[in-house]
């Protein structure tokens, strides 16, 4: 029977800069029941606080709800593991909420083949930003990326769409069924997961762009 091994805070994510969650990996338990607590203070404070919510993020997690989250302050946190034989602490983790944003995937992906009479046909792709993100405040800039491929192909074709929520693609193989997905990324932070795939059948008379 031994004191617990050193835990490690290995991941922190925020969907929208308004809330965030951190997860830790327990060290060895020393063969005894082990309790974990996450404590933190914010930059400029000396007062330590305990994790406000150990439930929402699942096992070995701490969730910071809206009232506990500030995108202007650095959070300095550590996890304490305690059993009957003693304690051990993780390294301090410095978290700036703006760096850990990982939005949900974009929503309402719509794909349509457009065949104007006077111009070449194209694939028109449209989507909406994830619901948890308020783009109106100007605090948030989302960038988008589209990927598509014929159903049986191995390689994806990637297109960067910038901040726009619609995109045109001209070069497609006629008669093929395509998968289309979109993802988003804040100006600082992580790419979201890809949205669920939308399928579109390209007509056989679709003229390839020169």
């Amino acid at each position: 029977q031994l004191p617990p091994g050193k835990p490690e805070i290995f991941k922190c994510r925020s969907p929208n800069k308004e809330t965030f969650t951190c997860w830790w990996r327990p060290g060895t338990d020393g063969g005894l029941p082990t309790n974990y607590s996450l404590t933190y203070h914010r930059e400029g404070e000396t007062l330590m606080h305990e994790c406000p919510d150990y439930i929402t993020g699942g096992p070995n997690s701490c969730h910071f709800g809206k009232q506990y989250t500030s995108m202007w302050r650095t959070y300095i946190m550590m996890v304490n593991a305690t059993n009957q034989m003693g304690s051990s602490f993780s390294d301090e983790l410095y978290v700036d909420v703006t760096y850990i944003v990982q939005p949900d995937p974009p929503l309402e992906l719509a794909v349509e083949v457009k065949q104007p009479e006077d111009r070449k046909p194209y694939l028109w792709i449209k989507w909406s930003p994830p619901t948890l993100i308020d783009l109106k405040t100007g605090w948030f800039t989302l960038l988008y990326e589209i990927r598509l491929k014929p159903e049986k192909a191995a390689e994806w074709e990637i297109h960067f769409a910038g901040q726009q929520t619609e995109f045109k693609i001209l070069s497609l193989h006629p008669g093929q069924k395509y998968l289309v997905q979109v993802r988003c990324k804040p100006d600082h932070g992580y790419w979201s997961a890809w949205s669920p795939a939308t399928f579109i059948q390209i007509p056989s008379d679709f003229t390839m762009n020169d």
């Epitope: 290995f10 922190c12 650095t74 390294d91 760096y99 850990i100 992580y190």
Partner: antibody, heavy 120, light 112 residues
Framework: QVQLQQSGPGLVAPSQSLSITCTVS????????VNWVRQPPGKGLEWLGI???????NYNSALMSRLSISKDNSKSQVFLKMNSLQTDDTAMYYC??????????????WGQGTLVTVSA | DIVMTQTPLSLPVSLGDQASISCRSS???????????LEWYLQKPGQSPKLLIY???NRFSGVPDRFSGSGSGTDFTLKISRVEAEDLGVYYC?????????FGGGTKLELK
């Protein structure tokens, strides 16, 4: 604990290239950015560039054409490669880990430095 | 590129004195996320630099409370309330808000 250990050649001939390896321990390269900073003898510090936790890079614009930073997460190694060295590239080269989880600046932990002399 | 200008170049002090170092940026170093990534480093002879202050006024872990940072926009100050022998060395300010990130030229804190 957090450590950054540097290795690389001490002497480089003019017009040749420089490669320095920074081997890290006590943290994961998938969680922290690593920067490179240099210091010519008796002079001040100059930021060269960063490779972020996700692998994206930013470089000092004055050196961008000659500089490349890469990493191998599984080996916990970060690499600095610089081409076409001249005598004014003689400097102590440091790697430094960011303070913030998944962040960029604030160089909280530094390597011991690699003194590179460019001379024929 | 943003130029960081430190004054004075050299600061002779007696132990126990208060010391003040100024750093001015050529343009605002408020990041697009609203934070100001202004940092202070101390380098002693033959050593790697050490982080003292991050985000203008926050002491890094283990940094004594005699060190304090202040300022906003383009004007920043590092103060040492009572200089001790271990504080001697070269101090650098640094902006990490706008790429390419840039250091100030350094201020040498030395004994009178």
């Amino acid at each position: 604990q957090v450590q950054l250990q540097q290795s690389g050649p001490g002497l480089v001939a003019p017009s040749q290239s420089l490669s320095i390896t920074c081997t890290v321990s006590g943290f994961s390269l998938t969680s922290y950015g690593v920067n490179w900073v240099r210091q010519p003898p008796g002079k001040g510090l100059e930021w060269l560039g960063i490779i972020g936790a996700g692998g994206s890079t930013n470089y000092n614009s004055a050196l961008m054409s000659r500089l490349s930073i890469s990493k191998d997460n599984s080996k916990s190694q970060v690499f600095l490669k610089m081409n076409s060295l001249q005598t004014d590239d003689t400097a102590m080269y440091y790697c430094a880990r960011s303070l913030y989880y998944y962040g960029s600046s604030s160089f909280a932990y530094w390597g011991q430095g690699t003194l590179v002399t460019v001379s024929a | 590129d943003i130029v960081m200008t430190q004054t004075p170049l050299s600061l002779p002090v007696s132990l126990g004195d208060q010391a003040s170092i100024s750093c001015r940026s050529s343009q605002s170093i408020v990041h697009s996320n609203g934070n100001t990534y202004l940092e202070w480093y101390l380098q002693k002879p033959g050593q790697s630099p050490k982080l003292l202050i991050y985000k203008v006024s926050n002491r890094f872990s283990g940094v004594p409370d005699r060190f304090s940072g202040s300022g906003s926009g383009t004007d920043f100050t590092l103060k040492i309330s009572r200089v001790e022998a271990e504080d001697l060395g070269v101090y650098y300010c640094f902006q990490g808000s706008h790429v390419p990130w840039t250091f100030g030229g350094g201020t040498k804190l030395e004994l009178k």
